[in-house]
Amino acid sequence: SNNKRAPYWTNTEKMEKRLHAVPAANTVKFRCPAGGNPMPTMRWLKNGKEFKQEHRIGGYKVRNQHWSLIMESVVPSDKGNYTCVVENEYGSINHTYHLDVVERSPHRPILQAGLPANASTVVGGDVEFVCKVYSDAQPHIQWIKHVEKNGSKYGPDGLPYLKVLKAAGVNTTDKEIEVLYIRNVTFEDAGEYTCLAGNSIGISFHSAWLTVLPAPGREKEITASPDYLE
């Protein structure tokens, strides 16, 4: 194509996680997928200065076709800010990642005491549950609702009926997953909500209850039973 274009990001979802807390001896990969015409070049800075191979034992790999920087077996001296600079003759863009190399003993995720907190609202109101997670390694976080089917909280196998409401994914940032919003609340939304955080050591979870009160002058709504989800 003859359409000249300054550099632009082609996959911002892969760049949303800026803070990377990584255990020592692990491999780190930073990506800055980009496009432009002519095809831009990519270079990397560490703490604002040119990042050279001799700056770390074992050097690093740059995969230009994947727009990535790879550092194997990270050590504490690798901590810092890593900036990709993508440029062509029509412009330049950059993106910075922060790397923290964790040396202390990794533990189960720790959830802040008292969160999520019990909440109450009227029908039609809004509510939010907050979950603060501390974890040495990147945790996977889920919000779960304990639901009923045919008036029972438990299935024939004795396990509870659960519904995953929200889970961290490629399109979800850490901040987004820490808060569960429930808009235009109905009586069906009442019940137990659980914030679950897991890492390679184990799983931790805290629960809270939502109480739904009738709105002034409104009849109680009739609600359908939720589906059984394992």
């Epitope: 396990l159 995953v164 890492n199 931790s204």
Partner: antibody, heavy 124, light 112 residues
Framework: EVQLLESGGGVVQPGRSLRLSCAAS????????MHWVRQAPGKGLEWVAV????????YYADSVKGRFTISRDNSKNTLSLQMNSLRVEDTAIYYC?????????????????WGQGTMVTVSS | DIVMTQTPLSLSVTPGQPASISCKSS???????????LYWYLQKPGQPPQLLIY???NRFSGVPDRFSGSGSGTDFTLKISRVEAEDVGVYYC?????????FGGGTKVEIK
């Protein structure tokens, strides 16, 4: 049936390498962290390493750090332990153990399923 | 690292009699989620360890109710109310709160 089956053990000289494998079946392997635990002859249990469900995080015991590498292939339901620069004190039965899953659990969140183990002997 | 200390080293028990094994940790195993991450295993000769008790006091599926776990913080006990011949082997406690995961040295239980 949930099962873990280790292989790759054998007799090796000090300083040499060996690669252990663990084949998982009966559960969604890609949803669980996995561990290696070892037991020297007539001795107690020693945790060796863990890898997260997606392979992004790995931790090692100080006694093997820099020599052993844990890895996984979720497409093949396989866990591996690459052991380099082996020492006489690495002689042990190596067990593959299922760790924590990704979701809500009723019951233990891991360390419930162990393989039968594979014997590694490091001797000159 | 959390150090797990188990006593006694060995135990000889008459069938039908109770047995008790102690385990102490160098740090509290009580987590912020309210659970105590202490596990108990039995390893029978020539077999891998099998889980008996998880999170201090919960019996794993299929484990007879003669096994019970108790304790708090740093002091833990595994009790067998009435020892049977099939209970022989080495018992281990394990902390599952942080890496490196650590085990007690083991208690060998045999029948008189």
């Amino acid at each position: 049936e949930v099962q873990l089956l280790e292989s790759g053990g054998g007799v090796v000289q000090p300083g040499r390498s060996l690669r252990l494998s663990c084949a998982a079946s009966g559960f969604t392997f890609s949803s669980y962290a996995m561990h290696w635990v070892r037991q020297a002859p007539g001795k107690g249990l020693e945790w060796v390493a863990v890898i997260s469900y997606d392979g992004s995080n790995k931790y090692y015991a100080d006694s093997v750090k820099g020599r052993f590498t844990i890895s996984r292939d979720n497409s093949k339901n396989t866990l591996s332990l690459q052991m380099n620069s082996l020492r006489v004190e690495d002689t042990a039965i190596y067990y593959c153990v299922r760790g924590a899953g990704r979701g809500y659990t009723y019951g233990p969140d891991g360390f419930d399923i162990w393989g039968q183990g594979t014997m590694v002997t490091v001797s000159s | 690292d959390i150090v797990m200390t188990q006593t006694p080293l060995s135990l000889s028990v008459t069938p039908g009699q109770p047995a008790s094994i102690s385990c102490k940790s160098s740090q509290s195993l009580l987590h912020s989620d309210g659970k105590t991450y202490l596990y108990w295993y039995l390893q029978k000769p020539g077999q891998p360890p099998q889980l008996l008790i998880y999170e201090l006091s919960n019996r794993f599926s299929g484990v007879p109710d003669r096994f019970s776990g108790s304790g708090s913080g740093t002091d833990f006990t595994l009790k067998i109310s009435r020892v049977e011949a099939e209970d022989v082997g080495v018992y281990y406690c394990m902390q599952y709160i942080e890496a490196p995961l650590t085990f007690g040295g083991g208690t060998k239980v045999e029948i008189k």
